[in-house]
């Protein structure tokens, strides 16, 4: 039925679109970039990304339409909705603070939650992170007892241990939790780069032509025989 199919008879896909036969008399067009519609008859108005703030663009009859995310309005979703214009968002005397696409309640002492509708209990849940222990110090105050290696009012900061590092023999400090590690140059190993790598064990053929390998701190040397010389007895 190919010669009588609409793809060949009426050539329905416009603007360079490609026609695909789906059945005896149905088809689908794959449009060139910049065109849209069942028959690629419309210019794709979404090509210029007119919709702002994460909204979804659709093209209808050469026009674009933006579906806005909550908190934005306008033809291109470019306008932030000021939720604080509508009273009652924040309970118990909380102050409404407008944010792009949303709002936040700044709660008075004793209240918490998105709408200031929950009673604030300093350590329930605990604001202390990284294993810190919360201790209530007043009706509305707390302090965090941090595990070694952490600091900050909620133990949120890993203390940098590298300023006091003791990496030896050219090792480079890498911070850890209440410790540090040393990235060693090839000739050294161990946590602090204090252990000499035995190159003679690692490279059995380090010395050529019957030369004997002698390990040294931070390197190795070759003892050459039979007139050979050079770093590896190859000369």
């Amino acid at each position: 039925y190919s010669t009588s199919h609409p793809c060949f008879v009426s050539r329905p896909c416009l603007n360079g679109g490609t026609c695909h036969m789906l059945s005896r008399d149905t088809y689908e067009c794959t449009c060139q970039v910049g065109f849209t519609g069942k028959e690629c008859q419309w210019t794709d108005a979404c090509l210029s990304h007119p919709c702002a703030n994460g909204s979804t663009c659709t093209t209808v009859a050469n026009q674009f339409s933006c579906k806005c995310l909550t908190g934005f309005t306008g033809q291109k979703c470019e306008t932030d909705v000021n939720e604080c214009d509508i009273p009652g968002h924040c309970q118990h005397g909380g102050t409404c603070l407008n944010l792009p696409g949303s709002y936040q309640c700044q709660c008075p002492q004793g209240f918490t939650g998105q709408y200031c509708d929950s009673l604030y209990v300093p350590c329930a849940p605990s604001p202390c992170v990284n294993g810190g222990t919360c201790r209530q110090t007043g009706d509305f105050t707390f302090e965090c007892n941090c595990l070694p290696g952490f600091e900050g009012s909620t133990c949120e900061r890993n203390i940098d241990d590298c300023p006091n590092h003791r990496c030896q023999n050219g090792g480079v400090c890498v911070d850890g939790v209440n410790t540090y590690n040393c990235r060693c140059p090839p000739q050294w190993t161990g946590q602090f780069c204090t252990e000499d790598v035995d190159e003679c064990l690692l490279q059995p053929n380090a010395c050529q032509n019957g030369g004997t390998c002698a390990n040294r701190n931070g390197g190795y040397g070759c003892v050459c025989v039979n007139g050979w010389s050079g770093d590896d007895c190859s000369e």
Partner: antibody
Framework: EVQLVESGGGLVQPGGSLKLSCAVS????????MEWVRQASGKGLEWVAA??????????VYSASVKDRFTISRDDSKSTLYLQMNSLKTEDTAVYYC???????????WGQGTLVTVSS | DIQMTQSPSSVSASVGDRVTITCQTS??????LAWYQQKPGKSPKLLIY???RLQDGVPSRFSGSGSGTDYTLTISSLQPEDFATYYC?????????FGGGTKVEIK
Amino acid sequence: EVQLVESGGGLVQPGGSLKLSCAVSGFTFSDFYMEWVRQASGKGLEWVAAQRNKANDFSIVYSASVKDRFTISRDDSKSTLYLQMNSLKTEDTAVYYCSRDGGKLALDAWGQGTLVTVSS
Amino acid sequence: DIQMTQSPSSVSASVGDRVTITCQTSEDIYSGLAWYQQKPGKSPKLLIYGASRLQDGVPSRFSGSGSGTDYTLTISSLQPEDFATYYCQQGFKYPLTFGGGTKVEIK
């Protein structure tokens, strides 16, 4: 043979300044951490300051008791370590030792020490 | 700063005795511990590094052990030249800190 020889100690009044030197030989100076350690008469050892090696950009660390008053430095061309001591206090009175950090997390070579007396 | 607690502060012993000195640190120092010997009017001398490694030229009667926060220096058979003060020192991180010292005296 590794050798460290301190000099520059003496009697100075509180608030005064003094510069200690430590001339080293027998090893490649820039390859090692260098430390100053002091010892008050009849007391234990107290670490004062350190300067890391070339591989660690000669970075410097001080004890809290001397920070902002003492300055450690080195002159590689002269293989000499220095300790500039300003705003001296009576509690800084001690024998000052220069030592080499031998790449083992330990101080494997020490000078003979130089006595600093801070008194009015 | 890492605190070093060395004990005892002094010990009376005789030639041939076995002497044990301990050093406790306020946090794990990953075996970054050294032991020094100091005689009156002299500079300290390194005996042990890395908690258990004998420095070149140091007699084998000296030995070190330990890990984490607990370390020990042992003199297996005390000799006349061993009467001195001994210090432990952590080399894990700055500021370097020393123990208070242990004076080994003749009984």
